[in-house]
């Protein structure tokens, strides 16, 4: 007899993994054998489609590699012509044992600054992620979080930060490992121990000793008046992350020399500094008879400020008068290549005439000062607001009582051209006289483009730098 | 009663061919999907093939995609395999077995007495 | 392919012994899941279909148990007639793959 088809297995709710078979049974009773359909989400599924399989007479339909976009509600439908069409529903839920999507990846972070471990996951259920440090579990804190998306942030990256690190995406299904990737903390070169300045006799031996961390080890360089270190020996040696240099020197003449401290973090270094001084004892002490002699300028510093075969006076207080006062002027003009256009030949013609002072020869062989009026046309119009800084320095005892030649001449004491003429020495390079004087530039246009340069800092009376950091 | 009964087994070069059938007896034989299933000498059960009872799905295993090719009369309550480019381990005794599919999931509940194939050169 | 895995391979038992041989689904395969007894020069024999029901004329010592991707068949008090090779087969998929077997041989 004929029979109404009737589904004696309603379709259940599947759950399969992604490539993995996922089958709906629908059972039907009728007479005579019944056509069976199936659709997903109200879309006829083609049965000769080849990712799936009909069986038992479409009463079995399985999916033979599960797919993400399977998801979805299946209803299988039989008629036989007898009564009307029956159906039934079941939804398939297509689970997904964890994968990592996006997996961390090696790290250099400089110290102090905010590193991002990615670890982007995939699953259904959604995967919990954590983080495992070495071979034990990552602890949350204020400055070490797992993100929503799974990444791991680290804020204000310390030291012992650096290490190895995997993330663990786990739900019902399994658990996912990320391969171990490296956090490494790079830390900026730092002077651990500056060298110390030393005022020594002729002759001595002097070891400067500087010492510097960072990660990377930095290296060091000893630089001497500006230049690379061209005698003394240098000794290194490293330990725990700690380079410690040692220079020895053979002291004929004072110098300032400056241990840099550099580092590389990628295509950028950092660096860190400090100097200290040497100078001789005896040296620069304030004679109060003219110890000198007159002798025409020889040096190459002063060469294109002082007049061709002028008559300098050399200040035999100095083991090597010519030498020693050259240093002194070339360490000075050193700081002046950061000064305004406008100042800087000012500038330059007041210290070559301040240092080397012209000399009147005689039976005692007398240095002759600048006049006043020059020194103020330097003060007050040309170098108006380096002048203010070097004052400002001066008096806060930032250059040493020793180095009076580079600290600024106080204008008011030098002699005035008006009160003897051949009292003072004058500048030929400013033009200084009356007529002429409304050529000087205003006080506005004497501002210079560039802050006068940080001359080193000292603590009491040695001359000493503190540590200074850069990234170049 | 149901009977399946296999025929068509023997002795046959690698590279050969044979027609394996199954004549069914004592069930409605077009009703029924049927499968081939064979046991190698001292080995497990391996599933080979299976029709619909309409003819209208056929699955085959991987390790004969391709040279066996399954097919049913259901005038004539046959079932048949042919098998072509035969290899060594294609030696077996081969089953026909019914799917029975009603309350439950598919399962084979009627099997033959099996006929061995041979393939040796 | 679903693979199936029986174990354990083989067991020595005595009669009137409980026999419990396992399968394991390398997926799950819900209920899908039968097993057969074959003796030496005979077809196989449906014994549990549907992983707990038992196929008529099956002596009710046979049991089965499990689903998604483990199950087992119990022997509750072995008889000299079940020393037989075991094998479990899944449905779920249209490759209906067997177990190894397990063969269950006299102590």
């Known amino acids: 007899l004929p029979k109404a088809p009737v589904i004696t297995t309603p379709l259940e709710t599947v759950d399969a993994l992604v490539e993995e078979v996922a089958t709906f049974m629908c059972a039907v009773e009728s007479y005579p054998q019944p056509e069976i359909s199936w659709t997903r989400n109200k879309i006829l599924i083609k049965l000769f489609d080849t990712r799936y399989s009909i069986r038992e007479n479409g009463q079995l339909l399985t999916i033979l590699s599960v797919e993400d976009s399977d998801d979805g509600i299946y209803c299988c439908t039989a008629n036989n012509g007898v009564g009307g069409a029956v159906e039934s529903c079941g939804a398939l839920q297509v689970k997904m044992k964890p994968k990592i999507t996006r997996p961390p990846i090696n790290v250099k972070i400089i110290e102090g600054l905010k590193a991002v471990l990615p670890c982007t996951t995939m699953g259904n259920p959604k995967p919990s992620v954590s983080w495992i440090k070495g071979d034990s579990p990552l602890r949350e804190n204020s400055r070490i979080a797992v993100l929503e998306s799974g990444s791991l942030r680290i804020h204000n990256v310390q030291k012992e930060d650096a290490g190895q690190y995997r993330c663990v995406a786990k739900n019902s299904l399994g658990t996912a490992y990320s391969k171990v990737v490296k956090l490494e903390v790079e830390v900026f070169a730092r002077i651990l121990r500056a060298p110390e300045s030393h005022n020594v006799t002729f002759g001595s031996f002097v070891t400067l000793h500087c010492t510097a961390t960072g990660i990377p080890v930095p290296t060091i360089t000893w630089i001497e008046n500006g230049n690379a270190v061209s005698s003394g020996s240098i000794q290194e040696s490293v330990k725990d992350r700690v380079i410690d240099s040692r220079l020895q020197l053979f002291i004929t003449k004072p110098g300032l020399y400056t241990c840099i401290a550099t580092n590389k973090h990628g295509e950028k270094f950092s660096t860190a500094k400090a100097a200290a001084t040497i100078s001789i004892a005896e040296w620069s002490k304030p004679q109060k008879d003219n110890k000198g002699y007159c002798a025409q300028y020889r040096g190459e510093v002063c060469n294109a400020v002082l007049a061709k075969d002028a008559l300098v006076f050399l200040n035999t207080s100095y083991a090597d008068p010519e030498e020693a006062q050259e240093l002194l002027v070339h360490t000075a003009w050193n700081e002046l290549k950061v000064v305004s256009p406008v100042c800087r030949p000012a500038a330059e013609a007041l210290l070559c005439n301040h240092i080397f002072q012209e000399c009147s020869p005689g039976v005692v062989p007398t240095p002759i000062p600048i006049c006043r009026e020059y020194c103020l046309a330097v003060k007050e119009l040309f170098c108006a607001k380096e002048w203010l800084v070097m004052e400002e320095k001066t008096h806060r005892g930032l250059y040493r009582s020793e180095m009076h030649l580079l600290s600024v001449p106080e204008c008011s004491k030098l002699p005035s051209m008006h009160w003897d003429p051949t009292a003072c020495a004058r500048l030929p390079h400013l033009d200084y006289n009356k007529e002429n004087l409304k050529t000087f530039p205003p006080m506005t246009s004497s501002k210079p483009s560039v802050d006068i340069p940080n001359l080193p800092s000292s603590s009491s009376s040695s001359f000493s730098v503190s540590p200074t950091y850069s990234m170049t | 009663e149901v009977q399946l009964v296999e025929s068509g087994g023997g002795l046959v070069k690698p590279g050969g061919s044979l027609r394996l059938s199954c004549a069914a007896s004592?069930?409605?034989?077009?009703?029924?999907?049927m499968h081939w299933v064979r046991q190698a000498p001292g080995k497990g059960l391996e599933w080979v093939s299976s029709i619909s009872s309409r003819s209208a799905y056929k699955y085959y295993a991987d390790s004969v995609k391709g040279r066996f090719t399954i097919s049913r009369d259901n005038a004539k309550n046959s079932l048949y395999l042919q098998m072509n480019s035969l290899r060594a381990e294609d030696t077996a005794v081969y089953y026909c077995a019914r799917d029975f599919f009603q309350l439950g999931p598919p399962r084979f509940d009627s099997w033959g007495q099996g006929t061995l194939v041979t393939v040796s050169s | 392919d679903i693979q199936m895995t029986q174990s354990p391979s083989s067991l020595s038992a005595s009669v009137g012994d409980r026999v419990t041989i396992t399968c394991r689904a390398s997926?799950?395969?819900?209920?899908?899941l039968n097993w057969y007894q074959q003796k030496p020069g005979k077809a196989p024999k449906l014994l549990i279909y549907?992983?707990?029901n038992l196929q008529s004329g099956v002596p009710s010592r046979f049991s089965g148990s499990g689903s998604g991707t483990d199950f087992t068949l119990t022997i509750s008090s072995l008889q000299p007639e079940d020393f037989a090779t075991y094998y479990c087969?899944?449905?779920?998929?249209?490759?209906?793959?067997f177990g190894q077997g397990t063969k269950l041989e006299i102590k």
């Open positions: 004592g069930f409605t034989f077009s009703t029924y999907t």
């Open positions: 549907g992983a707990s």
């Open positions: 997926q799950r395969i819900s209920s899908f």
């Open positions: 087969q899944q449905s779920y998929s249209p490759s209906y793959t």
